[in-house]
């Protein structure tokens, strides 16, 4: 039956988010084939007439590629043979958000899976002691967020406490007039405590922790993309 065989193959995608102005990865894996020349990968986007990307017979085939993706896409050619059809996307834009389809043909059959791709801006926060302030104050800064996130402070000692009355958050538009710098200040902090600054929008959640003791300051931060579910 060759590539026109009746069988369907398993194709798996993972919903993901792209950070605007950076590289993005649209993840897709499939049951591998032993011959690269028998594998066809097509990436499509809902509402877009041309293809996002096509890879067949061991190389990119871009004659049907939509202009909005020209020069912005590539598969990991050396990993296709092991079942990786993921797509690298250059300079992610807000308009790249949407539903993508990863469509695969191999000698074993064909299959496809959809992927929801969100776009925005997210960055790691950094929490520092603000020595310029008159009282014990913490300052949480994150350089790039979009859409506008919420900022919540928490403390290890005062779990469940509401810090909205003793904190002040501002959003400053960056020079490109899209993303914003997030600055949040927490007042009246106590020593020997760990404070967390949590920044969240519908794309990502980031946390910056600071532990202040008599002798040292320890910092830690992490970022998690939301809605990363496989399909």
């Amino acid at each position: 039956f060759g590539i026109s065989g009746r069988h369907s193959i398993t194709v798996t995608t993972v919903a993901s988010a792209g950070n605007i102005g950076e590289d993005g990865i649209l993840s897709c894996t499939f049951e591998p084939d032993i011959k690269l020349s028998d594998i066809v990968i097509q990436w499509l986007k809902e509402g877009v007439i041309g293809l996002v990307h096509e890879f067949k017979e061991g190389k990119d085939e871009l004659s049907e590629q939509d202009e909005m993706f020209r020069g912005r896409t590539a598969v990991f050619a050396d990993q296709v043979i092991v079942g990786n059809a993921s797509l690298r996307l250059k300079n992610v834009q807000l308009t790249d958000a949407g539903t993508y389809k990863c469509y695969i043909i191999t000698s074993k059959g064909k299959g496809n899976a959809n992927l929801e791709y969100k776009t925005g801006a997210f960055s790691m926060p950094e929490v520092n002691v603000d020595y310029n302030a008159s009282s014990e104050t913490l300052r949480c800064e994150a350089p790039r967020w979009f859409p506008q996130p919420t900022v919540v402070w928490a403390s290890q000692v005062d779990q469940g406490a509401n810090f909205s009355e003793v904190s002040n958050t501002s959003f400053e538009l960056n020079s490109e007039n899209v993303t914003m710098k997030v600055v949040s200040v927490l007042y009246n902090v106590t020593i020997n405590n760990t404070y967390s600054c949590m920044i969240e929008n519908d794309i990502a959640k980031a946390t910056g922790d600071i532990k202040v003791t008599e002798s040292e300051i320890k910092r830690r931060s992490h970022l998690q993309l939301l809605n990363s579910k496989a399909s």
């Epitope: 102005g21 950076e22 871009l62 004659s63 020069g71 690298r88 250059k90 300079n91 899209v178």
Partner: antibody, heavy 121, light 107 residues
Framework: EVQLVQSGAEVKKPGASVKVSCKAS????????IGWVRQAPGQGLEWIGD????????NYNEKFKGRATITRDTSTSTAYLELSSLRSEDTAVYYC??????????????WGQGTLVTVSS | DIQMTQSPSSLSASVGDRVTITCKAS??????VAWYQQKPGKAPKLLIY???TLQPGVPSRFSGSGSGRDYTLTISSLQPEDFATYYC?????????FGQGTKVEIK
């Protein structure tokens, strides 16, 4: 090893055209964009445009649109830059360069040796 | 079109000095900034791409940083072979653009 070998120096009269070639080897020619950059004597680098040999798609600096034509011959793995209506200000070293990232247009990571084009009456 | 404004246009430094060169994009924002080194009569050489990724084989004294519209190339300890002209390149958009160049000379 990626290699880009350019054609030799040219002397042209104002109003004439010049065609510079760039022969690629050491990689799959049709899978990577090739760009053209020029440098006038004592001046900086100026991006002219680029081509994706796999499909012949091109991009041009607005300044050169209508005067520069970038083409390729996949059978010989060669890219070409043709510049018409030459003037003295076009006297420069013309470089071809491979763009990193295959079908993804990356930075220029491998360069030809350059071709000096002199425009003089 | 995006323009890249590079500064300074030239600088004098000594071996061992820390050197910083900056490029400012006229608009937009993305991480697609590369840095090149060029010596007289030679083709440019890629040092750094995607703001801060060092090209294989390039010494670690070269580093890149930046975000938004402002980007920086730093040479932590200038070596004799580093005296050259440096260019930034914006390659995120359809139209690429180089900075005007910075000539690093011996003091």
């Amino acid at each position: 090893e990626v290699q880009l070998v350019q054609s030799g120096a040219e002397v042209k009269k104002p109003g004439a055209s010049v065609k510079v070639s760039c022969k690629a080897s050491g990689y799959t020619f049709t899978s990577y964009w090739i760009g053209w950059v020029r440098q006038a004597p004592g001046q900086g680098l100026e991006w002219i445009g680029d081509i994706y040999p796999g499909g012949g798609y091109t991009n041009y600096n607005e300044k050169f649109k209508g005067r520069a034509t970038i083409t390729r011959d996949t059978s010989t793995s060669t890219a070409y830059l043709e510049l018409s209506s030459l003037r003295s200000e076009d006297t420069a070293v013309y470089y071809c360069a491979r763009l990193d990232g295959s079908s993804y247009r990356g930075a220029m990571d491998s360069w030809g040796q350059g071709t000096l084009v002199t425009v003089s009456s | 079109d995006i323009q890249m404004t590079q500064s300074p246009s030239s600088l004098s430094a000594s071996v061992g000095d820390r050197v910083t060169i900056t490029c400012k994009a006229s608009q937009g924002f993305n991480k697609y900034v590369a840095w090149y080194q060029q010596k007289p009569g030679k083709a440019p050489k890629l040092l750094i791409y995607y703001t801060s990724t060092l090209q294989p084989g390039v010494p670690s004294r070269f580093s890149g940083s930046g975000s938004g519209r402002d980007y920086t190339l730093t040479i932590s300890s200038l070596q004799p072979e580093d005296f050259a002209t440096y260019y930034c390149l914006q390659y995120g958009n359809l139209l690429y653009a180089f900075g005007q160049g910075t000539k690093v000379e011996i003091k």
